[in-house]
Amino acid sequence: VVSHFNDCPDSHTQFCFHGTCRFLVQEDKPACVCASGYVGARCEHADLLA
């Protein structure tokens, strides 16, 4: 399935702890693009291997 990404709705501006929230339009779900040094579904963990 090819998904289309856009900025998340305002309701989810704080969804990603250390990263940028992206909206998966077709699935109606948020996803996080983590900042360097962070991992996890919501970029909630420091990457100890970085």
Partner: antibody, heavy 116, light 107 residues
Framework: VQLQESGPGLVKPSQSLSLTCTVT?????????WNWIRQFPGNKLEWMGY???????SYNPSLKSRISITRDTSKNQFFLQLNSVTTEDTATYYC??????????WGQGTLVTVSA | DIQMTQTTSSLSASLGDRLTISCRAS??????LNWYQQKPDGTVKLLIY???RLHSGVPSRFSGSGSGTDYSLTISNLEQEDIATYFC?????????FGGGTKLEIK
């Protein structure tokens, strides 16, 4: 996925309204948000709240002091409880599966009348 | 809360017509606008999401457009089965809110 609302069609003022949504064809713990929406006489729709697949809840601030949404994962059901009802709570109540912006699948709705 | 306004509460059209239903938000909702169809028996179905995307199984005669605060649903080549009430809903900000509905009738 199919959703089916059930519960009493008549509730007395000051009592609690309790409804059940039975979900078939999809596990409510797998994904998505499981919502309650109501439609007042005259067609106005109001989102009431949801319980997510993880069990977290979010409620409409207009109802926050009176509403509770819970679930029974073993029966794949989720529930609405609305306390201290008045005649203004007379409406058709729908359950619906949603994501973070829309309601993709709805139940058929159940009419609840609040009257003495 | 974001207020959603459908200024036309009822609309009369003939079979085969092309018609447009409008919806206005009280603030920018960034294309997070969905359309629903409610049949006379109360059945509700999602038609269009994120302004212009067709939900699965929805006929291509339905289309959506808009941006910012102003959005519209267009039905081309109106069919008998399209007789229903149409609601818009914003998905940008909690609490999610709906328009008052536009009831479609046949001339």
């Amino acid at each position: 996925v199919q959703l089916q609302e059930s519960g009493p069609g008549l509730v007395k003022p000051s009592q609690s309204l309790s409804l059940t949504c039975t979900v078939t064809g999809y596990s409510i713990t797998s994904d998505y948000a499981w919502n309650w929406i109501r439609q007042f006489p005259g067609n106005k729709l109001e989102w009431m709240g949801y319980i997510s697949y993880s069990g977290s809840t979010s409620y409409n601030p207009s109802l926050k002091s009176r509403i509770s949404i819970t679930r029974d994962t073993s029966k794949n059901q989720f529930f609405l409880q609305l306390n201290s009802v008045t005649t203004e709570d007379t409406a058709t109540y729908y359950c619906a599966r949603g994501g973070i912006t829309r309601f993709a699948y709805w139940g058929q709705g159940t009419l609840v009348t609040v009257s003495a | 809360d974001i207020q959603m306004t459908q200024t036309t509460s009822s609309l009369s059209a003939s079979l085969g017509d092309r018609l447009t239903i409008s919806c206005r938000a009280s603030q920018d909702i960034r294309n997070y606008l969905n359309w629903y169809q409610q049949k006379p028996d109360g059945t509700v179905k999602l038609l269009i999401y994120y302004t212009s995307r067709l939900h699965s199984g929805v006929p291509s005669r339905f289309s959506g457009s808009g941006s910012g605060t102003d959005y519209s649903l267009t039905i081309s080549n109106l069919e008998q089965e399209d007789i229903a009430t149409y609601f818009c809903q914003q998905g940008n900000t909690l609490p999610w809110t709906f328009g008052g509905g536009t009831k479609l009738e046949i001339k």
